[in-house]
């Protein structure tokens, strides 16, 4: 039985040209994490394999950095990076857990303007 839950950073926004950390956390299970895949829609961004370590897809190598932890850092953001991101935890013996993050990349002025009205 799959008892675990994935906690994610949820819906986040970031400024064009900036960077953002995509973070998921698997809790409430003792299952062993064998691999974590990070995907954007159907495109593979990165893999973190328990034995083989991190692998960034060649097309993202210049803009994606592994970590912190099992998370992923996206750099030099563009408006085209807006969309859904998925962390897919492959575990033993539970199976697969999936978390979803929605990233909105905003034009600099919009992001700054929006920040003024954020509730602390």
């Amino acid at each position: 039985m799959m008892t675990g839950t994935i906690e994610t950073t949820g819906n986040i926004s970031a400024e064009k040209g900036g960077s953002i950390i995509l973070q998921c956390h698997l809790s409430s299970t003792t299952a062993q994490v064998t691999q974590v895949n990070w995907e954007q829609q159907d495109q593979l961004l990165a893999i973190c394999n328990a034995d083989l370590g991190w692998h960034i897809s060649p097309s993202f190598k210049d803009r994606v950095a592994p970590g912190p932890g099992l998370g992923l850092t996206l750099q030099s953001l563009t408006v085209n990076d807006t969309g859904e991101y998925f962390c897919i935890y492959h575990t033993y013996p539970d199976g697969t857990y999936t978390g979803r993050i929605f990233l909105e990349v905003l034009e600099s002025s919009v992001a700054e303007h929006g920040a003024r009205f954020q509730i602390p």
Partner: antibody, heavy 122, light 107 residues
């Protein structure tokens, strides 16, 4: 051209170890993962494990854990697979095979060695 | 481990026939599936990677399709040199398991 050349056939007694080599040429050795696959007589393909020639990290099928070692020598562009505590069921052809894309997750194996026959018999 | 099940285990066909081989994974593997051809006494040869991408130098009569758990290799018009054994393999998670193989024989 891209080539993987394996060492010659071996005959071993049960309980012994065998070390098979696979020498790569024609490409940047450190950039491509190398898998080992075996095939018992009349049987299908069985994936044994993989090595990253750059850092030396390995991953093995559970069946071979504790019995297999995969190493590499970057100076000679050679990978090695050593299997210990041999039994008759280990009689097979052993292949090394290169991942098809450099510096990436190993999606498929596009270049294969010629195979090394290992016979385990008392 | 992910189990890969191929069907049929063998089939008989004639030159010119359309041949379809299926492969099922025990869990979703997205499109991380490869197809290999092996002839007796020879090393396997990569035909298709990422479920549907044709490996360089492979004739266009070979095609792959599918995603998730169900995949298909199709030979549109079987040629004499295509009589061989075909294997699927998943490359999502280590260990990168193979299917049991499908032997294509002459009818």
């Amino acid at each position: 051209q891209v080539q993987l050349v394996q060492s010659g056939a071996e005959v071993k007694k049960p309980g012994a170890s065998v070390k098979v080599s696979c020498k790569a040429s024609g490409y940047t050795f450190r950039s491509y993962y190398m898998s080992w696959v075996r095939q018992a007589p009349g049987q299908g393909l069985e994936w044994m494990g993989i090595i990253d020639p750059s850092g030396g990290r390995t991953s093995f099928a559970q069946k071979f854990q504790g019995r297999v070692t995969m190493t590499r020598d970057t100076s000679t562009s050679t990978v090695y697979m050593e299997l210990s505590s041999l039994r008759s069921e280990d009689t097979a052809v052993y292949y090394c095979a290169r991942a098809r894309y450099p510096e990436s997750w190993p999606y498929g194996m596009d270049v294969w060695g010629q195979g090394t026959t290992v016979t385990v018999s008392s | 481990d992910i189990q890969m099940t191929q069907s049929p285990s063998s089939l008989s066909a004639s030159v010119g026939d359309r041949v379809t081989i299926t492969c099922r994974a025990s869990q979703s593997i997205n499109s991380y599936l490869n197809w290999y051809q092996q002839k007796p006494g020879k090393a396997p040869k990569l035909l298709i990677y990422a479920a549907s991408s044709l490996q360089s130098g492979v004739p266009s009569r070979f095609s792959g399709s599918g995603s998730g758990t169900d995949f298909t290799l199709t030979i549109s018009s079987l040629q004499p040199e295509d009589f061989a054994t075909y294997y699927c393999q998943q490359s999502l998670l280590t260990p990168f398991t193979f299917g049991g193989g499908t032997k294509v024989e002459i009818k």
